[in-house]
């Protein structure tokens, strides 16, 4: 898998998208996990609704949300109030039984100052551009974030 780089601005929200083959992954729940080290496990942050038919509903863990367009084949993760410690390697996963297929490897980069990256096209219209080695960058100023995994989010 190539790694896709998504860049967001500290304090703002970042939206990560993971396209997939909707037929191949029909009926499967999805998850967003954080890679712990280069060879370490991928720690689950949030997963889609336990009822696949309701995967379109936003599910939150702390300030990270996940929603799945199962017909269009796009998993969307929102990282709200992006912080420097959110930078790192993540994965979008498709779950089946106790197994998980990687849909996309994602490198989240947190920019300190939007003026440092002033290309209006990048800032306002998320797009892709080829970068070093096997990574490509998606600049985005979108919506949402991640705090440590909690089993059941607070009530409000």
């Amino acid at each position: 898998h190539n790694t896709t780089v998504f860049q967001g601005v500290a304090g703002q929200s970042l939206q990560v998208s993971c396209p997939y083959d909707s037929m191949k992954h029909w009926g499967r729940r999805k998850a967003w996990c954080r890679q712990l080290g280069e060879k370490g496990p991928c720690q689950r942050v949030v997963s889609t609704h336990n009822l696949w038919l309701l995967s379109f509903l936003r599910r939150w863990n702390g300030s990270t949300a996940i929603t799945d367009d199962t017909l269009g084949g796009t998993l969307t993760i929102t990282l709200r109030n992006l912080q420097p410690h959110d930078a790192g390697l993540y994965q979008c996963q498709s779950l089946h039984g106790s197994e998980a297929d990687t849909l996309r490897k994602v490198l989240v980069e947190v920019l300190a100052d939007p003026l440092d990256h002033r290309d209006a096209g990048d800032l306002w219209f998320p797009g892709e551009s080829e970068s070093f080695e096997d990574a490509h960058v998606e600049h985005s100023i979108s919506r949402s974030l991640l705090e440590g995994e909690i089993p059941f989010p607070p009530t409000s």
């Epitope: 729940r29 997963s47 609704h49 336990n50 009822l51 038919l53 309701l54 379109f56 509903l57 936003r58 599910r59 939150w60 949300a65 929603t67 367009d69 039984g97 059941f152 989010p153 009530t155 409000s156």
Partner: antibody, heavy 118, light 112 residues
Framework: QVHLQQSGPEVVRPGVSVKISCKGS????????MHWVKQSHAKSLEWIGV????????SYNQKYKGKATVTVDKPSSTAYMELVRLTSEDSAIYYC???????????WGQGTTLTVSS | DVVMTQTPLTLSVTIGQPASISCKSS???????????LNWLLQRPGQSPKRLIY???YLDSGVPDRFTGSGSGTDFTLKISRVEADDLGVYYC?????????FGGGTKLEIK
């Protein structure tokens, strides 16, 4: 403080339609979906359907497909449910309840009483 | 659809005494993610339902620890160790493991 405010009671004739509203406040409205639940003497509580306030997608209990349509107006933080071709069987209290991913129905509206009578 | 059956229909309890409500489902509520989406609501007289217990045994915020939820598979129980006047109302179990969500018929708790 999370609050779901529903529209007032309705008394209507059989065969007409009615639209019930549910306004959310005290939280970011588009963060959580909205469910609709029917409470009647005959059938206790029944789940009707749900709408994503974020993307507008919906899902319905098969039993209520064609009977209920749920919509959302993001600017006013309001969810709606329209019930069509009303009969006496539709007389009930209708609740909106907030979705909370892991376990929905964490907050409920006060209920809207619908009476269908000729 | 999954059928949720509650017993008893009505429960008459003296203040300070324990109470127990049973809820049985027509299919196992253990989900493939390892969680069991069995939950309890309380509807006090003249009020909207209120979430009480979720995922079998987790108490919602503000719910006193006199309440306990237990069970697995298809058999579940809600227990109140010492009933108080504030506990009267109708208790509903409901499941979120299978589509669509379904509710039990309710158990009315009365104070003797």
């Amino acid at each position: 403080q999370v609050h779901l405010q529903q529209s007032g009671p309705e008394v209507v004739r059989p065969g007409v339609s009615v639209k019930i509203s549910c306004k959310g406040s005290g939280y970011t409205f588009t963060d959580y979906g909205m469910h609709w639940v029917k409470q009647s003497h005959a059938k206790s509580l029944e789940w009707i359907g749900v709408i994503s306030t974020y993307n507008g997608n919906t899902s319905y209990n098969q039993k209520y497909k064609g009977k209920a349509t749920v919509t959302v107006d993001k600017p006013s933080s309001t969810a709606y449910m329209e019930l069509v071709r009303l009969t006496s069987e539709d007389s009930a209290i209708y609740y909106c309840a907030r979705d909370f991913g892991y376990v929905p129905f964490d907050y409920w509206g006060q209920g809207t009483t619908l009476t269908v009578s000729s | 659809d999954v059928v949720m059956t509650q017993t008893p229909l009505t429960l008459s309890v003296t203040i300070g005494q324990p109470a127990s409500i049973s809820c049985k489902s027509s299919q196992s509520l253990l989900d493939s993610d390892g969680k069991t989406y069995l939950n309890w609501l309380l509807q006090r007289p003249g009020q909207s339902p209120k979430r009480l217990i979720y995922l079998v045994s987790y108490l919602d915020s503000g719910v006193p620890d006199r309440f306990t939820g237990s069970g697995s598979g298809t058999d579940f129980t809600l227990k109140i160790s010492r009933v108080e006047a504030d506990d009267l109302g109708v208790y509903y179990c409901w499941q979120g493991t299978h589509f669509p969500y379904t509710f039990g018929g309710g158990t009315k708790l009365e104070i003797k």
